[in-house]
């Protein structure tokens, strides 16, 4: 998977008046990394692992970047003409990626009241707008404003892209990100399904990086995809991930089934418990 940096900024308006302040979150490799603390007006690391990425360096640069971006977005919201009474939001999501082959990708997306209305592929300078008339109107509105603003030229977008990549590379220099390996906790549970059947679920949690193989085996052979149900691999809020896989088996055949896990070049197999629950730490 590519390394990525994702900025998520939101500004609000009430009865046509743009509110001061903004909401901002930054994700590094899909994990919550920074957020903007509105009380302290500072960028704050999200959790211990984020603090470890920069070590003892300050977050002044991040604070400056987010503040500037927030200000830009507030100005953009002020130029959206169709603001009705009540609460409205403008959200900008910017992502830059570095792939294994060192190629880079960068994109920008705008949402009004949670609805996507404008996207840009920064490399190709291609803008895309959804079909809906509301999206078309909003997009025209915002693009006209961005064109008027001398700052928002092609050069500006490429600079923004370059800044994002520069920051990402800076974070990746930290061994915390590149060499971080947290083995999963694997836990197998069983629950009664229909008569004569049980559902067995294998959960892997607190692992990093995100890539993992989790599959049920019968007699040592992987079950086919259509007989297993997989959960998404999701952040668990601690800078690590979690996922699960489940299958239905005949009661009395538990001994034939094992959950196979592979992560960061290590693997383990986990039997179905005879009782209700069995928790196993993968000791590498």
């Amino acid at each position: 998977e590519p390394h990525s940096l994702r900025y998520n900024l939101t500004v609000l308006s009430w009865d046509g008046s743009v509110q001061s302040g903004f909401l901002a979150e930054v994700h590094l490799d899909g994990q919550p990394f920074l957020r903007y603390d509105r009380q302290k007006c500072r960028a704050k690391p999200q959790g211990q692992w984020a603090e470890d990425v920069l070590g003892n360096k300050t977050w002044d640069r991040e604070t400056r970047d987010l503040t500037g971006n927030g200000k830009d977005l507030r100005m953009t919201l002020a130029h959206i003409k169709d603001q009705k009474e009540g609460l409205h939001s403008l959200q900008e999501i910017r992502v830059c990626e570095i792939h294994e082959d060192n190629s880079t990708r960068s994109s920008q997306h705008f949402y009004y009241d949670g609805e996507l209305f404008l996207s840009q592929n920064v490399e190709t300078e291609e803008w895309t707008v959804p079909q809906s008339s509301r999206a078309q109107t909003l997009a025209m509105n915002v693009r006209n404003f961005l064109k008027e603003d001398a700052m928002k030229t092609k050069t500006h977008y490429h600079a923004m892209h370059a800044d994002c990549l520069q920051e990402l590379r800076r974070y990746l220099e930290s061994s915390v990100v590149l060499r971080r390996r947290v083995p999963p906790m694997v836990n197998v549970t069983r629950s009664e399904a229909s008569e004569g059947n049980i559902t067995v679920t294998c959960r892997a949690s607190s692992f990093y990086p995100r890539n993992i193989t989790l599959t049920w085996r019968q007699d040592g052979v992987s079950l086919s995809h259509d007989t297993q149900q997989w959960g998404d691999v999701l952040p668990d809020g601690n800078g690590t991930y979690q996922t699960w896989v489940a299958t239905r088996i005949c009661q009395g055949e538990e001994q034939r089934f094992t959950c196979y896990m592979e992560h960061s070049g290590n693997h383990s197999t986990h039997p179905v418990p005879s009782g209700k629950v069995l928790v196993l730490q993968s000791h590498w």
Epitope: S222, T258, Y260, P271
Partner: antibody
Framework: QVQLQQSGPELVKPGASVKVSCKAS????????IYWVKQSHGKSLEWIGY????????VYNQKFKGKATLTVDKSSSTAYMHLNSLTSEDSAVYYC???????????WGQGTLVTVSA | DIQMTQTTSSLSASLGDRVTISCRAS??????LNWYQQKPDGTVKLLIY???RLHSGVPSRFSGSGSGTDYSLTISNLEQEDIATYFC?????????FGSGTKLEIK
Amino acid sequence: QVQLQQSGPELVKPGASVKVSCKASGYAFTKYNIYWVKQSHGKSLEWIGYIDPYNGGTVYNQKFKGKATLTVDKSSSTAYMHLNSLTSEDSAVYYCATTDGYSLFTYWGQGTLVTVSA
Amino acid sequence: DIQMTQTTSSLSASLGDRVTISCRASQDISNYLNWYQQKPDGTVKLLIYYTSRLHSGVPSRFSGSGSGTDYSLTISNLEQEDIATYFCQQGNTLPFTFGSGTKLEIK
């Protein structure tokens, strides 16, 4: 490539026991089960049981429970089958096999001939 | 236990022939049927798994088919190196069981 190297032929007396070994190479030993199969002279094949080398979990054919004991030594990537209280009925070629995770008995050892004779 | 029956214990065919070996299970095995080749020196190799999936490195002249209780292995163009005994095996239910084998000879 995957290879399973079995120990040499054994000539044993009735009532004695024997330990057949199967050394795996060419893959991560603890990733895949090791299966054991018996072939009596001129006859078909019979599945004895299997072992998960990662945690030592075993599943046996009821017919061979009490006759065969499966173990592994992870440090040497070797699986063992111990056969006890041998009789002439136990004279056979014994094979170990492993899987690629997609099919049973994907790769086989060359077989070990066990002869039980007074 | 599930019985696997290979009614033909030996079969004679000429090089280049199309040869079919059949195997019947005593109950439905849901396509969990594998075919193995045992050479005269005792070497055993997997040919086909899950009824029709060709194991890597096995020549495409080998194919498998069937469902329920009836299965077959076909060699489309018999070659000298195919002289061996062929066993079917079910992997649906424990204990795993094998057919008695079909010995293939050259006419």
